[in-house]
């Protein structure tokens, strides 16, 4: 178990032109607050349990009113840390979402108006117990500077808060009741496996399977406080029958459970049973209601205002999870046709189409001639990945928009002269030749050397 702590240092306009002067409008005072959502491992948008490591909401910051014309000051921030308690192991790699919210304090019907100013997300490596890590993130024109760390709650230690720091040597070496026992690393390794049920707070073992009691505790599992009346003289580690010291503190002594939670000892530590409306290792986290703004990404919160009532977040398109903190990967359904690229804009999808396709979902094939015009009497021909125009005589180019010089290719054979004509070209043949392209020699007897005439054509008819 442990606590993730987030310290916001500053939030304000980022560098560069076009940065906003202030998050507040000139007319209305406002104040900022922050929300953090933590997830283990994976990317911040991964489809896994919502804020599985926990979430926290800051207090509201001081009220700020923009003074027109005045230089933009540092925006006043909420006091204190954002703390996210975690019960299990710290994952080492985690993802975070930090949202900056503005609360406008005008005369709106229904109370203050909230709006999401900025949302930053990232994935980081962090060992528990390490120093504060500093970070700067930009969201649009805003810049957020913050530090964070993860620390273990005693008796947990280590980079994942999974090792329990127990005495491995005699208690005299540790001092009664001292749980992390010693700063020496070898004394804070995973404990020996003592007798099953041996009190982790008041018992220890130097050999596997035994359960020796700290002073002030007795019983086979060291769970029974020794009566002070039987204490005769200070001794070392007590047995069930010898004298004792004043009882050492038990895990539930002083009731570590806040907000009316009841404490019960467990084989490893203690457990708080929290009243409705509270949760956390020590019932220190108050119950979340709609008044706390538990819904991320502009989700609509529905539920009562009293701590006993649950809330439900109605998520905007593109988000899901009990707090609307998970982005839905709608593109995984491959909604864009014909190999189009899908972009999830949050409020909608956008398809970017491959060449030859168009439409909101790339559903239109531009290779067919629908909607395409071939100019100057050309005819559209489908196929081949791009539409093609078969152009009328005298025109060329992709869409038959270019005037073609029909004589450029020297189409008239045997020295015939070419003349451009509105309907194409005309060949004026040299003496002794005939045909549309002057391709046939004329015999002196006047008969032409034509191939066999097709039906309906007499030799000598002009061929076009």
């Amino acid at each position: 178990a442990g606590v993730f702590e987030l310290q916001i240092h500053s939030f304000g306009p980022g560098p560069g032109p076009g940065a906003p002067r202030s998050p507040c409008s000139a007319r209305l005072p406002c104040r900022l607050f922050f929300r953090v959502c933590l997830k283990p491992g994976l990317s911040e948008e991964a489809a896994e349990s919502p804020c599985a490591l926990g979430a926290a909401l800051s207090a509201r910051g001081p009220v700020y009113t923009e003074q027109p014309g005045a230089p933009a000051p540092d925006l006043p921030l909420p006091d204190g840390l954002l703390q996210v308690p975690f019960r299990d192991a710290w994952p080492g790699t985690f993802s975070f979402i930090i949202e900056t919210w503005r609360e406008e304090l005008g005369d709106q019907i229904g109370g203050p108006a909230w709006s999401l100013l900025a949302r930053v997300a990232g994935r980081r490596r962090l060992a528990a117990g390490g120093p504060w890590a500093r970070d700067i993130q930009r969201a649009g024109a805003w810049e957020l500077r913050f530090s964070y760390r993860a620390r273990c709650e005693p008796p947990a230690v280590g980079t994942a808060c999974t090792r329990l720091c127990r005495p491995r040597s005699a208690p005299s070496r540790c001092g009664p009741g001292l749980r992390p026992c010693a700063p020496l690393e070898d004394e804070c390794e995973a404990p020996l496996v003592c007798r099953a049920g041996c009190s982790p707070e008041h018992g220890f073992c130097e050999q596997p399977g035994e359960c020796r009691c700290l002073e002030g505790w007795t019983g086979p599992l060291c769970t029974v406080p020794v009566s002070t009346s039987s204490c005769l003289s200070p001794r070392g580690p007590s047995s069930a029958t010898t004298g004792c010291l004043v009882p050492g503190p038990g895990p539930c002594d002083g009731n570590p459970c806040a907000n009316g939670g009841s404490c019960s000892e467990t084989p490893r530590s203690f457990e708080c049973t929290c009243p409705r409306g509270f949760y956390g290792l020590r019932c220190e986290v108050s119950g979340v209601t709609c008044a706390d703004g538990p819904c991320f990404n502009g989700g609509l919160c529905v539920g009562g205002a009293d701590p006993d009532s649950a809330y439900i977040c109605h998520c905007p398109p593109g988000f899901q999870g009990s707090n609307c903190e998970k982005r839905v990967d709608r593109c995984s359904l491959q909604p864009c046709r014909n190999g189009g690229l899908c972009l999830d804009l949050g409020h909608a999808l956008r398809c970017r189409c491959r060449a030859g396709f168009a439409g909101p979902r790339c559903e239109h094939d531009l290779d067919d001639c629908a909607g395409r015009a071939c100019a100057n009497g050309g005819t559209c021909v489908e196929g081949g990945g791009a539409h093609r125009c078969s152009c009328a005589l005298g025109f060329g180019g992709r869409d038959c928009r270019e005037r073609a010089d029909p004589c450029a290719a020297r189409p008239c054979a045997h020295g015939g002269r070419c003349y451009a004509h509105f309907s194409g070209l005309v060949c004026a043949c040299a003496p002794g030749y005939m045909g549309a392209r002057c391709e046939f020699p004329v015999h002196p007897d006047g008969a032409s050397a034509l191939p066999a005439a097709p039906p309906g054509l007499r030799p000598g008819d002009p061929q076009r």
Epitope: G140, P317, P335, H347, A348, R361, L366
Partner: antibody, heavy 128, light 112 residues
Framework: QEQLVESGGGLVQPGASLTLTCKAS????????MCWVRQAPGKGPEWIAC???????AYSASWAKGRFTVSKTSSTAVTLQVTGLTAADTATYFC??????????????????????WGPGTLVTVSS | DIVMTQTPASVEAAVGGTVTIKCQAS??????LAWYQQKPGQPPKLLMH???VLTSGVPSRFSGSGYGTEFTLTISDLECADAATYYC??????????????FGGGTEVVVK
């Protein structure tokens, strides 16, 4: 016929605030984003912000965040609120429609990425 | 954000001639390009979207082509009514999650 009409422009002092209104008629307001584009004299259009009518999602240019706020005020009108006006904001402000398309059974709308209907514009002059 | 660069800034051609306007995007936008025509005192008018799809009512003298980062608008058989400024426009979606629109600087077409 389909129409957009802007109003609210005029001569304003530097530092002042202004609210422009765009009224739509002749088409279904839903499944469209209503956008604001401005054009300074002699310059090209510059996109400011849009609001998607189905769910009220607003998105704006990075330079416009903080000073320009787009809102849907009725089933046929959107507004653009501008604060801290300077001479650089002098321009004709256009309201433009960016169509979104929905398909039966599909959970999402699809953005078109272009503006297929524009209003005539309203001129905003910032000068002392 | 994406940057759209148009060339030339101005072009002059005779009636019946052909004009070609180029638009370059700073990143791959696939076919996500629109062209607009704007005359003085009027709002822009959508001519074409998806790089090559003509808007209803726009004459087939206007044609568009291109893909990725390089796009072209061609106006053939120029008419006096084609004298205007032409803008290209695309939408963008940045990795930070912001969606928006960008216009080119414009090309003025003068018809002699």
């Amino acid at each position: 016929q389909e129409q957009l009409v802007e109003s609210g422009g005029g001569l304003v002092q530097p530092g002042a605030s202004l609210t422009l209104t765009c009224k739509a008629s002749g088409f279904d307001f839903t499944s469209n984003a209503m956008c604001w584009v401005r054009q300074a004299p002699g310059k090209g259009p510059e996109w400011i912000a849009c609001i998607y009518n189905d769910d009220g999602s607003a998105y704006s240019a990075s330079w416009a965040k903080g000073r320009f706020t787009v809102s849907k005020t009725s089933s046929t009108a959107v507004t653009l609120q501008v604060t801290g006006l300077t001479a650089a904001d002098t321009a004709t402000y256009f309201c433009a429609r960016s169509p979104y398309y929905t398909y039966g059974g599909a959970p999402s709308a699809y953005a078109s990425g272009y503006f297929n209907l524009w209003g005539p514009g309203t001129l905003v002059t910032v000068s002392s | 954000d994406i940057v759209m660069t148009q060339t030339p800034a101005s072009v002059e051609a005779a009636v019946g001639g052909t004009v070609t306007i180029k638009c370059q995007a700073s990143e791959n936008i696939y076919n996500s390009l629109a062209w607009y025509q704007q005359k003085p005192g009027q709002p822009p008018k959508l001519l074409m979207h998806d790089a090559s799809v003509l808007t209803s009512g726009v004459p087939s003298r206007f044609s568009g082509s291109g893909y990725g980062t390089e796009f072209t608008l061609t106006i053939s058989d120029l008419e006096c009514a084609d004298a205007a400024t032409y803008y290209c426009q695309s939408d963008y979606y940045s990795t930070g999650g912001s969606y928006g629109f960008a216009f080119g600087g414009g090309t003025e077409v003068v018809v002699k």
